[in-house]
């Protein structure tokens, strides 16, 4: 499956939008840093089948969409930027869904890669729990925004590696 050229452009736009969502100086939030235990092994493609990688990437973007489309995120972050971010993520999801169907068929893919998908879901559960515990403070959102930028960058790197293998 060939992801369209607009897909990588969309990735870059999503990262730029995340960067623009900054509301306060991160320098004031150092004490709020937290280990979300990013599931790095799910992004190391040594043993990856392409279909598995696509399923993991799809889950990553879906969970990012879910995280940023809560009422708490709307209250904390710029709505115009959020709306643009949703559009980019929605396009990414559509591109990846087309790929999943081409690679393995829509039925079996979630079952085949259940462990990988579960690892991504648990990662986002930890992020949501952290936000709840921190009462969705400005610094908590700043830490989460930085974490999502990092995980998004790692997702982009995985997509680049998949493309170079074609």
């Amino acid at each position: 499956c060939d992801l369209p050229q607009t897909h990588s452009l969309g990735n870059r736009r999503a990262l730029i939008l995340l960067a623009q969502m900054r509301r306060i100086s991160p320098f004031s939030c150092l004490k709020d840093r937290h280990d979300f235990e990013f599931p790095q092994e799910e992004f190391d493609d040594k043993q990856f089948q392409k279909a598995q990688a696509i399923s993991v990437l799809h889950e990553m973007i879906q969970q990012t969409f879910n995280l940023f489309s809560t009422k708490d995120s709307s209250a904390a972050l710029d709505e115009t930027l959020l709306d643009e971010f949703y559009i980019e993520l929605d396009q990414q999801l559509n591109d990846l869904e087309s790929c999943v169907m081409q690679e393995v068929g829509v039925i079996e893919s979630p079952l085949m890669y259940e462990d990988s998908i579960l690892a991504v879901r648990k990662y986002f559960q930890r992020i949501t729990l952290y936000l709840t515990e921190k009462k969705y403070s400005s610094c908590a959102w700043e830490v989460v925004r930085a974490e999502i930028m990092r995980s998004f960058s790692l997702s982009i790197n995985l997509q680049k590696r998949l493309k170079s293998k074609e």
Epitope: A19, P26, K31, A146
Partner: antibody, heavy 121, light 107 residues
Framework: EVQLVQSGAEVKKPGESLKISCKGS????????IGWVRQMPGKGLEWMGI????????AYSPSFQGQVTISADKSISTAYLQWSSLKASDTAMYYC??????????????WGQGTLVTVSS | DIQMTQSPSSLSASVGDRVTITCRAS??????LNWYQQKPGKAPKLLIY???SLQSGVPSRFSGSGSGTDFTLTISSLQPEDFATYYC?????????FGQGTKVEIK
């Protein structure tokens, strides 16, 4: 391979200006902050300040606020430390180091080789 | 600013000795404490981050412990290449601050 390469040693006179550099390579320059550390001859490490190259936001130690300026040019992956008017007491080794910002990763894991600044009349 | 106080400021030890350096913060810094090793004419090298995490490539004889205000760096069996100056540094809040250093010398 991650590298921070600093500009060469400088010999200056009191009152002169100076700008030293720190070029990052082997990683995404805007994903890490760059901090500056001073070490005067035979003395310990002193933290001077830091910059987020993604938007050039800076923070300084009170001891260095107004004495130096930290800047960055993300297009060439380079951070700078500058003085508008050097003093003899600025004679020291200056190091740059990268910091992961708010991400849970090792602090100041890579350092530049240092730039020796000598200020003498 | 948070003050970092290291002790001792210097110590003499022999190869094979167990060496302990302590660092105390003037207020709680959680686990946001790093340890660095510096040899003459060289840049500092990160040994331990977040109080107890061993930096990649650093020998396992180095270990760190503590949280809040009191921290310890331990070298379980001192090697010839370990003779250097060691610094603690807090990264809980800006401005970051270093301890004054502990010089480990050959007895």
């Amino acid at each position: 391979e991650v590298q921070l390469v600093q500009s060469g040693a400088e010999v200056k006179k009191p009152g002169e200006s100076l700008k030293i550099s720190c070029k990052g390579s082997g990683y995404s320059f805007t994903s890490y902050w760059i901090g500056w550390v001073r070490q005067m001859p035979g003395k310990g490490l002193e933290w001077m300040g830091i910059i987020d190259p993604s938007d050039s936001d800076t923070a300084y130690s009170p001891s260095f606020q107004g004495q130096v300026t930290i800047s960055a040019d993300k297009s060439i992956s380079t951070a700078y430390l500058q003085w508008s008017s050097l003093k003899a007491s600025d004679t020291a080794m200056y190091y740059c180091a990268r910091h992961p910002g708010l991400n849970w990763a090792p602090d100041f894991d890579y350092w530049g080789q240092g730039t020796l600044v000598t200020v003498s009349s | 600013d948070i003050q970092m106080t290291q002790s001792p400021s210097s110590l003499s030890a022999s190869v094979g000795d167990r060496v302990t350096i302590t660092c105390r913060a003037s207020q709680s810094i959680s686990k946001f404490l790093n340890w660095y090793q510096q040899k003459p004419g060289k840049a500092p090298k990160l040994l331990i981050y977040f109080a107890s995490s061993l930096q990649s490539g650093v020998p396992s004889r180095f270990s760190g412990s503590g949280s809040g205000t009191d921290f310890t760096l331990t070298i379980s069996s001192l090697q010839p290449e370990d003779f250097a100056t060691y610094y603690c540094q807090q990264s809980n809040t800006l401005p970051f601050t270093f301890g004054q250093g502990t010089k480990v010398e050959i007895k």
